[in-house]
Interface confidence: low
């Protein structure tokens, strides 16, 4: 996630009009305080995502944190965020308006919390005090969040001076509780559904025996409740759950369900949430994609993985040169599709000591009635190389003709060379490269010839040596990225009388 | 890079046929999916029809019936052919490449034609 101009931080002048451009490879979305502002996004050119938020004419009210985030319907595996906090000094407002529940601080043990006074100019002094007492306390002050430390069960107030006004707070009250520890989980059938199917989610309690659950979900906001079943798992420890069923999913119930779960004895509670997406329609899409030309190793096994993402769960199937492929029996070929997540496949071929006639084009297509997508690639499969022969002719002209072929996949590469003293060569001396010289000694020339039903190269590549004065060894290597092989022969001048 | 290039468009009478043309060239591998949209002025831009590299067609509910998306793999062209046409018909018509997935969202097209007009006259 990239957030242009950079923050963490921005002051801007009251009125103003501020853009905000987030950036990432997947679909994001800005939100301030769980809501989302209006904002534009859009697929950039080259595949990105944007999501711009423009501040227009700019208040007080506007200073707060914002959020750049994964839009949800990507599920949790892209839960990354990024902040930037805005501050609009505006002298017509002091503290930032609060929400009257967030005035009432409940406090478990002695831990450390935070009264929430906030203002809109980071340039101001902020000063806490005891209610009862003028006496400023000596608690660090963060303009982002407000007054951070330990806090006894008393009245606080939150002061400070804008122009030549003091200005007060609301009144905050801190509440210690002694509670005793409360197991909340909180699981979904399904987190992602389609119109029309069901959505079941389960708050389950371990170890309470009486205790309250609330509900919290999309369809409340138009009125329409939904009565959750109780259900008592006894046992040791005890469980209690509360279920939701929702028969037929709307559009409008994608969201998030929150059970909060409150011990009726001590006012204790835990809350916890998921969020459920539906979705009009089903969906494939591809998550990864491979190269158009993927390497196997001649005798060597080789897995193509393809990463995709789908809901309802797709078929699979692979192809090779358009023809369907299936597990063999012989196990030269083995298929899987495995469910990594909700929502998330992937699709494995393996084949078993690669054959050259599994060289070809593969498609792997993954579909159901709303979708489809399908990836395809050449399978390239790679052959050592070898020497199948070297020769010798000896035309009428006094030259000696060399001819040397052999194969390989991928394409491979000649290399003459030539050594004079017999007894030390090759290991003692090193060889001579022969080429086309420009003295006209030696004259090469080279065939490529691609042999398709054998999906590997042949290469011959013939030697003229115009005049050999003394016995010499001739060695023709073949090279490719799977490995080296030569053979060599040992030339003598027409005029001795022996050959080797 | 892929480029999509139209053709096809007039002035005909409501009631009559039409067949657009959209040619693609520079293919990628992972472009699976070629459909056209509609703008007309003052409104947003509008899925019509796509087809996929294997055949799969998907329409907008309003021309299904009328319209009917092709593609010639050999030339690497998809055709439109619009029948019955009615004024509201009336638009800009782009050619949209991409590789899948909400193939009835524009946001599933990376690469856009300039358009073809199409006009519809009562």
């Known amino acids: 996630l990239v957030i242009t101009p950079p923050g963490p931080e921005f002051v801007l002048n009251i009125s103003s009009t501020f853009v905000l451009t987030c950036s990432s490879s997947a679909p994001v979305m800005w939100e301030q305080m769980s809501q989302v502002p209006w904002q534009e996004a859009a697929m950039n050119q080259d595949g990105t995502f944007s999501s711009v938020l423009t501040l227009t004419n700019v208040t007080g009210g506007d200073t707060g944190e914002y959020f750049c985030v994964y839009n949800n319907s990507l599920g949790p595996e892209l839960s990354e965020r990024k902040r930037i906090y805005i501050f609009v000094p505006d002298p017509t407002m002091g503290f930032l308006p609060m929400d009257s529940e967030d005035l009432f601080i409940f406090v478990t043990d002695v831990t450390e919390t935070t009264i929430p006074c906030r203002v809109t100019d980071p340039q101001l002094e902020v000063t806490l005090h005891e209610k009862k007492v003028d006496i400023p306390l000596h608690v660090p002050y963060d303009h982002q969040r407000g007054f951070i430390g330990t806090f006894e069960d008393k009245t606080y107030i939150c002061k400070t001076t804008i122009g030549d006004r003091e200005v007060d707070s609301d009144t905050y009250y801190v509440y210690s509780l002694q509670v005793s520890s409360i197991n909340v989980s909180v699981n979904a059938v399904q987190t992602v559904v389609r119109q029309g199917e069901s959505i079941t989610i389960r708050c389950i309690v371990m170890g309470n025996d009486v205790v309250n659950f609330q509900w919290t979900y999309p369809r409340m906001k138009s009125g329409r409740l939904v009565e959750p079943v109780t259900d008592y798992l006894f046992g040791v420890p005890s469980r209690i759950g509360s279920i939701l069923h929702i028969p037929t999913a709307e559009l409008s119930d994608s969201g998030t369900y929150t059970c909060n779960v409150s011990v009726s004895v001590n006012d204790h509670g835990d809350e916890k949430a998921i969020n459920v997406t539906v979705i009009e329609n089903g969906y494939v899409r591809l998550l990864e994609t491979l190269e158009d030309v993927q390497i196997a190793e001649l005798h060597r096994s080789r897995t193509l993985q393809v990463v995709f993402e789908a809901y309802p769960t797709p078929s699979v199937l692979w192809f090779k040169d358009n023809r369907t492929l299936g597990d063999s029996s012989a196990g030269e070929l083995v298929l899987s599709t495995r469910n990594v997540s909700e929502t998330r496949y992937v699709s494995e071929l393996t084949l078993v000591r690669v054959k050259v006639s599994e060289a070809g084009y593969y498609t792997m297509r993954a579909f159901h009635a709303d979708d489809q997508v399908q990836l395809s690639f050449k399978l390239q499969v790679n052959v050592p190389v070898r020497v199948l022969e070297l020769s010798e002719s000896h035309p009428a002209n006094g030259e000696q003709i060399l001819r040397c072929r052999g194969r390989g996949m991928p394409q491979p590469n000649v290399t003459w060379s030539t050594c004079r003293d017999l007894k030390r060569c090759p290991r003692k001396l090193s060889p001579t490269p022969l080429g086309n010289s420009s003295k006209e000694e030696s004259q090469l020339e080279t065939n490529v010839t691609f042999w398709e039903e054998d999906q590997e190269y042949e290469v011959v590549s013939t030697l003229r040596l115009r005049h050999v004065d003394q016995p010499l060894s001739v060695r023709c290597m073949l090279q490719n990225s799977m490995g080296r092989d030569s053979q060599e022969v040992t030339v003598v001048p027409h005029s001795l009388p022996f050959k080797v | 890079e892929v480029q999509l290039v139209e053709s096809g468009g007039g002035l005909v009478q409501a009631g009559d046929s039409l067949r657009l043309s959209c040619t693609v060239s520079?293919?990628?591998?992972?472009?699976?999916?070629t459909g056209w949209f509609r703008q007309a002025p003052g409104k947003e831009r509008e899925f019509v029809a796509a087809i996929h590299q294997i055949g799969s067609t998907y329409y907008r509910n309003s021309v299904k019936g009328r319209f009917t998306i092709s593609r010639d793999g050999a030339k690497d062209t998809v055709y439109l052919q619009m029948n019955n046409l009615k004024p509201e018909d009336s638009a800009v018509y782009y050619c949209?490449?991409?590789?899948?997935?909400?193939?009835?969202?524009?946001?599933?097209?990376?690469?856009w034609g300039q358009g073809t007009q199409v006009t519809v006259s009562s």
């Open positions: 949209a490449a991409g590789n899948g997935g909400y193939v009835m969202s524009d946001i599933a097209y990376g690469t």
């Open positions: 520079g293919r990628t591998f992972n472009t699976y999916v």
